[in-house]
Amino acid sequence: WDPVALKLPERNTPRNSHCHLSNSPRAIEHAYQYGGTANSRQEFEHLKGDFGAKSQFSIRLRTRSSHGMIFYVSDQEENDFMTLFLAHGRLVYMFNVGHKKLKIRSQEKYNDGLWHDVIFIRERSSGRLVIDGLRVLEESLPPTEATWKIKGPIYLGGVAPGKAVKNVQINSIYSFSGCLSNLQLNGASITSASQTFSVTPCFEGPMETGTYFSTEGGYVVLDESFNIGLKFEIAFEVRPRSSSGTLVHGHSVNGEYLNVHMKNGQVIVKVNNGIRDFSTSVTPKQSLCDGRWHRITVIRDSNVVQLDVDSEVNHVVGPLNPKPIDHREPVFVGGVPESLLTPRLAPSKPFTGCIRHFVIDGHPVSFSKAALVSGAVSINSCPAA
């Protein structure tokens, strides 16, 4: 399967008619939040305009991180590259000139939680870093005959696993935590990300611990040490901002699956154990969309499935599989790639809202150690209102 390429819309959508909380919490327009996972990022593939000889990038930045990647682009082998990152709270702009590296480092620290305008310019073997329109830092290296062969994507907020290690100090290759806005190349806005991993709108207002799944869609793929076999117990708390959406999905190559989702406020568990589909559901007396936290537990004991929603419970007994097979399979939380949905599993909306205290078989699951966070998912913080 391929991670779904998710784009973030620019306007807040209206309040969900069934939900106490708006499905788009208050956020800064055109600003996106990065961090929470090591490789939180947006990727921009097809850029208008060439930046071979001369380029001027500009961006707005707000962070409290001391270290982390803000911008990175390179050729395939990462011999030619350009990067902006944080080191000890200072901004570092770097690119190569032939085999040498030109590095410009700010004297001031900019991890003060305030917005800063940053312009980074490359003109062949010269570089300029302009911060807040006031401080201009400039460096040059002797020119070379080598041509600069940069190839997309531009990585914003972080890089793909394994990238940038060759050129950037280890504690700055991981995603920075904070917000970016208004990325421009040579005065033209760069808006449509081809892929998004753990990036949400830049929310305003109080935040609390949890993993937030934004309306734009996304999902978490759990680390492979977690898998759902013949017997398991999954428990988690949800505070939805929409009355429908995928909560948990596990799928094996031979078509067996577990799917937990909400549909119009009802929680449904569907299972296929290699014989046929079977399902159970709970319609809570208290709406899950009331702005409070609700606890959901799914227990599978071979062909018996139990669903608990708060204090309400239901069961289904499926057919016995005479030769049950225990698979290791990826577990998706908050959404599922469409390529994995079988005809029997109608395409389901991704979940919108917050999930916390996710536990499998008594072991707390850290989403920050997930195998993949795709789309508009904020790992460690949820808008509280």
Epitope: F226, N227, I228, G229, L230, K231, F232, E233, I299, D301, S302, N303, V304, Q306, V313, N314, H315, V316, V317, L320, N321, P324, D326, H327, R328, I360, D361, G362, H363
Partner: antibody, heavy 119, light 113 residues
């Protein structure tokens, strides 16, 4: 404390049916699965099936599907197992057993009802 | 159905002796998700229902003396009594707790010399 009360013995004729009872006390009856187990003298136990009093969900051992019918009466916190078309092969001790919860073991057993099928 | 095979069918021992009995299942009882083996050992004395000694193959039920130890994984399991006492004379059953239908072994009867 948890108690599962079962009649000590039942004597029935071949071909007849019998309804064995198991009255639960000392815990919330509707919260836990109740299982039934058969044990013939000198043999290992055999699992018949399980029922959840709240949802009414039942999971049978295929071997006993046409023999046993599990039901509950929530108002009296009693589980029942009806055995039909009795033969001498059905003569055994029948236990009702409470399960701690799904994925866990049996935590309480009744004392068992000795069923004798004889003319 | 998973078939549980116990051996030996009976054991004659003297007090203080170490005893081991075996239980084999026709399919693995190891759950890959939580890496637990769903095998339970019971002790049954005459006229009484079975009593849980060990669950998850090696976890001792509270109140069970530590001379009882469960071990093994997958399809091969062992119950060991480090020093048999007179009150340990009983029939010991292993049970597949992994998949339905739940199945029991035929038992190992522990007798005193």
């Amino acid at each position: 404390q948890v108690q599962l009360q079962q009649p000590g013995a039942e004597l029935v004729k071949p071909g007849a049916s019998v309804k064995l009872s198991c009255k639960a006390s000392g815990y919330t009856f509707t919260t836990y699965w109740m299982h039934w187990v058969k044990q013939r003298p000198g043999q290992g136990p055999e699992w018949i099936g399980m029922i959840h009093p709240y949802s009414g969900a039942i999971n049978y051992n295929e071997k006993f599907k046409s023999k046993a019918t599990l039901t509950v009466d929530k108002s009296s916190s009693t589980a029942y197992m009806q055995l039909s078309s009795l033969t001498s092969e059905d003569s055994a001790v029948y236990y009702c057993v409470k399960q701690l919860r799904l994925l866990y073991y049996f935590d309480y057993w009744g004392q068992g009802t000795t069923l004798t099928v004889s003319s | 159905d998973i078939v549980m095979t116990q051996s030996p069918s009976s054991l004659t021992v003297t007090a203080g002796e170490k005893v081991t009995m075996s239980c084999k299942s026709s399919q693995s009882l190891l759950n890959s998700g939580n890496q637990k083996n769903y095998l339970t050992w019971y002790q049954q004395k005459p006229g009484q229902p079975p009593k849980v000694l060990i669950y998850w193959a090696s976890t001792r039920e509270s109140g069970v003396p530590d001379r009882f130890t469960g071990s093994g994984s997958g399809t091969d399991f062992t119950l060991t009594i480090s020093s048999v006492q007179a009150e340990d004379l009983a029939v010991y059953y292993c049970q597949n707790d992994y998949s339905y239908p739940l199945t029991f072994g035929a038992g190992t009867k522990l007798e005193l010399k």
